[in-house]
C-alpha cells in the first residue's frame, strides 16, 4: 500500500538477497511501505549471525530503509553431538553440515547395539533428523549376556573363573561381602537383604566390577545414587521379595570384562525347568570356611519346587520358608552351593535361541550349612518381578 | 511491554553445576529472535554465552560449549542456562536478553548475581 | 574470534564538552551489526546505538554514532552529567558474538 507523503525521500529499491525473494515487489517505496524477505527451503534469514524468524523493513521518513537486508544463509545443523559409546560418519562429505547433509551414527561394535539405522539428515528446521523423524540422538545400547564360560550341562566342582566368564559380576563391599549383577551400564539387580540399610546410608557402599580376584587393586569403581528395595520384602521375616535395585552415579563403559547380563525373556521359564542346569558365580564362603579370593562358580541343577519347600519343612531355615516368589537349585547330596558373601549374586542360564545369558535368579538364602544334603541353595525368582524392575528403570 | 527475569542459587559450590531460569513475559520465544545468556564479571567485562532461537536452535561461544547448555520450556516461556563444573572464575552477574537486530527491540533482564565458593 | 577493542578505558569530561570514544574491530564488522550500550551502576546495560548510527528509543540527539570496516565510535557533541556511565560496543556480525571492554566516562 502506498501513503504518499510529499515531504519525505523515496527508499531506495529493495534488492532480495541470494536465494530469497522479496515481497510485495513495487516500482517505488514511500514512507511506511514496507517489504518482507522470504528465503528458500534449506534457507533461513541471518541479520549478521543472529537467525530470525521474519522479517520486514519499513521505509522511513528520511528515505531509508529501518533495517539492512538480511542474509538468507544455508540452515546449518552444526557438529552432530557426540554419541555416548558410539561414533558419528559424515556421508556427504567431510565435516559437511547443511540442508540436506547425512551423517550416519554407529555404535562401538561388539559391546554396544542401536535399534535404529542410525542415519540422520539435517533438515531445514534445522535439526539433525533420523528416517522416523526423531531429532534426539539414537541410543547405544550395552550388548548383554555375552560370556566366554561354556556351560557343559554337567556338574562340576566349584572352580575358579576365568576373565570375561562372568562380566555381570558386580562385588558390593559394605559391612559384609555380597554381590551383585549389572544389569545396564548404571543399574545392578541384587538381593534386598544385601542392601538392607542402605537407602539412606549408600556411601557406605562400595561397588566394583571388572574384576575375578575379591582384593584386586585395579577395578572399576562405582557408586550407587539410589537404591530400590522391593516394597514387599521385610527385613528379618523371611527372605519373600528379596529383591533390590542399584541406581549407579555413572554409567559403566561395557567391555569384555564389564557387560550386562539378560533379563529373561518372556520364554524363559521354559529354559528353568527342574533339572535344567544354571551358573552362579561369587566371593562367598568356601568350603574351607573363607571368603574366596578368587571368583568362583558352579554350575548346578534346578530343584523340583516342591521337593525345595518339603526340603525346608523337614529342616526349617529360621524364619524363612520357600514362596512362589524363589526358585531352587542344588544337588540332592549336596556338595554344590552358593554361601554367605554370594548373596545378590546372579543365577544364569543360557538362551540357546540367542545364545545370551540371562539372569534366572538372584542369590538369597539356604541351609546355615551351605552345600549340605538336601539343603538347596533358595534364589529370588527374577521371572516374577520383570514388571518391578521395568517400572522402577522407566520411571527414574 | 516485554519482560525478562533472571532466578537462581546465588551461591554455588566449585566443581558443581549451575542452572538459571529466565522467565519472558509480554513475548513468546517461539515468536522469533534469539534468546541470549551474558553475563558480567566483577571487573565488569561483558561475555555473550549463547543463544537458544526462536526455533530452539542453540549456539554457544566456543570457549564455554564443552560446560555450557541452553534449553527451553516453550509452555511455561522460559529458557535456561546450565553450566556444568563451575569455578571461582564463574563469579559473576548473569543476564538473559534479547539483543537487537538491527531495529531498536533490545531487552535485558536486571541479571542475578552467582557467587562460586565452598 | 572478533575482538573489540574500546579506548580510552576511562575518561573524563566537562559539562559542555565534546566526547568521543572508539571501538576497534580485529576484523571487519558490516556497520549494521554494531552496537553501543550504557550501563549504570547497579543497572543492565541499556541500548544506545544501533546499526553504527540509529539512535535507541529516547537516547538524546547529542548522541551519534559513526564507522565502518575495523573502525567505530560514539559522539557526545556535548557532556551532560547524566552521560556519565560506561558504554560498551558489541558486534554481532559474525558468531560467538563480542563486547569491548569498555569506557567509562566520568565527569570532570
Known amino acids: 500500500h502506498h501513503h504518499h507523503h510529499h515531504a519525505s525521500q523515496p527508499c531506495p529499491d529493495p534488492t532480495a538477497p541470494p536465494n530469497g525473494h522479496i515481497s510485495p515487489v513495487q516500482a517505488t517505496y514511500v514512507l511506511k511501505d514496507s517489504f518482507s524477505v522470504f528465503c528458500k527451503t534449506g534457507f533461513e534469514l541471518l541479520q549478521g549471525s543472529v537467525p530470525l524468524k521474519s522479517f520486514t523493513a519499513v521505509c522511513q521518513k528520511d528515505g531509508s530503509w529501518d533495517r539492512p537486508i538480511p542474509e538468507c544463509s544455508i540452515i546449518d545443523c552444526g557438529p552432530p553431538d557426540d554419541l555416548p559409546n558410539g561414533h558419528v560418519d559424515y556421508i556427504t562429505g567431510p565435516e559437511v553440515t547443511t540442508y540436506k547433509a547425512v551423517i550416519q551414527y554407529s555404535c562401538e561394535e561388539t559391546f554396544y547395539t542401536m535399534s535404529s539405522n542410525g542415519k540422520y539428515v539435517c533438515e531445514a528446521d534445522g535439526f539433525w533428523t533420523s528416517s522416523k523423524g526423531e531429532k534426539s540422538l539414537p541410543v547405544c545400547k550395552p550388548v548383554c549376556g555375552l560370556s566366554t564360560h561354556t556351560s557343559g550341562g554337567r556338574i562340576i566342582g566349584g572352580q575358579p573363573a576365568k576373565p570375561g566368564d562372568f562380566p555381570w559380576q558386580v562385588l558390593l563391599l559394605g559391612e559384609t561381602t555380597a554381590a551383585g549383577a549389572l544389569i545396564h551400564d548404571d543399574w545392578v539387580l541384587t538381593a534386598a537383604h544385601a542392601v538392607y540399610g542402605k537407602t539412606e546410608a549408600m556411601s557406605s557402599l562400595d561397588i566394583r566390577m571388572g574384576i575375578l580376584k575379591r582384593l584386586s587393586l585395579i577395578y572399576t569403581q562405582a557408586w550407587p545414587e539410589a537404591v530400590f528395595i522391593h516394597e514387599g520384602y521385610t527385613h528379618g521375616a523371611g527372605f519373600d521379595n528379596d529383591i533390590a535395585l542399584i541406581k549407579l552415579k555413572n554409567k559403566v563403559t561395557i567391555n569384555r570384562n564389564i557387560m550386562p547380563i539378560c533379563l529373561p525373556r518372556k520364554e524363559a521359564a521354559s529354559l528353568m525347568k527342574t533339572d535344567f542346569v544354571g551358573t552362579v558365580a561369587g566371593w562367598g564362603l568356601t568350603q574351607k570356611g573363607f571368603l574366596a579370593r578368587n571368583l568362583m562358580f558352579v554350575d548346578i541343577p534346578i530343584v523340583d519346587h516342591q521337593k525345595c519347600a518339603t526340603a525346608y519343612t523337614k529342616q526349617p531355615y529360621p524364619g524363612a520358608k520357600v514362596t512362589v516368589n524363589m526358585l531352587c537349585a542344588g544337588l540332592d547330596r549336596g556338595g554344590k552351593d552358593s554361601c554367605r558373601g554370594d548373596a545378590g549374586g546372579a543365577l544364569v542360564f543360557l538362551d540357546n535361541e540367542t545364545q545370551r545369558w540371562f539372569v534366572g535368579g538372584i542369590v538369597s538364602w539356604g541351609s546355615i550349612n551351605c552345600g549340605g544334603s538336601e539343603q538347596y541353595g533358595v534364589y529370588t525368582k527374577v521371572t516374577n518381578y520383570i514388571p518391578w524392575i521395568e517400572n522402577i528403570i522407566n520411571n527414574f | 511491554d516485554v519482560q525478562l527475569q533472571e532466578s537462581g542459587p546465588g551461591l554455588v559450590r566449585p566443581s558443581q553445576s549451575l542452572s538459571l531460569t529466565c522467565t519472558v513475559t509480554?513475548?513468546?520465544?517461539?515468536?522469533?529472535?534469539?534468546w541470549n545468556w551474558i553475563r558480567q564479571f566483577p571487573g565488569n567485562k561483558l561475555e555473550w554465552m549463547g543463544y537458544?532461537?526462536?526455533?530452539?536452535?542453540?549456539s554457544y561461544n566456543p570457549s564455554l560449549k564443552s560446560r555450557l547448555s541452553i534449553t527451553r520450556d516453550t509452555s511455561k516461556n522460559q529458557f535456561f542456562l546450565q553450566l556444568n563444573s563451575v569455578s571461582s572464575a564463574d563469579t559473576a552477574t548473569y543476564y538473559c536478553?534479547?539483543?537487537?537486530?538491527?531495529?531498536?527491540?533490545?531487552?535485558w533482564g536486571q541479571g542475578t548475581t552467582l557467587t562460586v565458593s565452598s | 574470534q572478533t575482538v573489540l577493542t574500546q579506548s580510552p578505558a576511562i575518561m573524563s569530561a566537562s559539562l559542555g564538552e565534546r566526547v568521543t570514544m572508539t571501538c576497534t574491530a580485529s576484523?571487519?564488522?558490516?556497520?549494521?551489526?554494531l552496537l553501543w550500550y550504557q550501563q549504570k551502576p547497579g543497572s543492565s546495560p541499556k541500548l544506545w546505538i544501533y546499526?553504527?548510527?540509529k539512535l535507541a528509543s529516547g537516547v538524546p540527539v547529542r548522541f551519534s554514532g559513526s564507522g565502518s570496516g575495523t573502525s567505530y565510535s560514539l559522539t557526545i557533541s556535548s557532556m551532560e552529567a547524566d552521560d556519565a556511565a560506561t558504554y560498551y560496543c558489541?558486534?554481532?556480525?559474525?558468531?560467538?558474538?563480542?563486547f569491548g571492554a569498555g569506557t567509562k566516562l566520568e565527569l570532570k
Open positions: 536478553a534479547i539483543i537487537s537486530t538491527a531495529v531498536d527491540f533490545d531487552y
Open positions: 509480554g513475548y513468546s520465544i517461539t515468536s522469533d529472535y534469539a
Open positions: 537458544i532461537s526462536y526455533s530452539g536452535r542453540t
Open positions: 576484523s571487519s564488522v558490516s556497520s549494521s551489526y
Open positions: 546499526s553504527t548510527s
Open positions: 558489541l558486534q554481532y556480525n559474525r558468531s560467538p558474538l563480542t
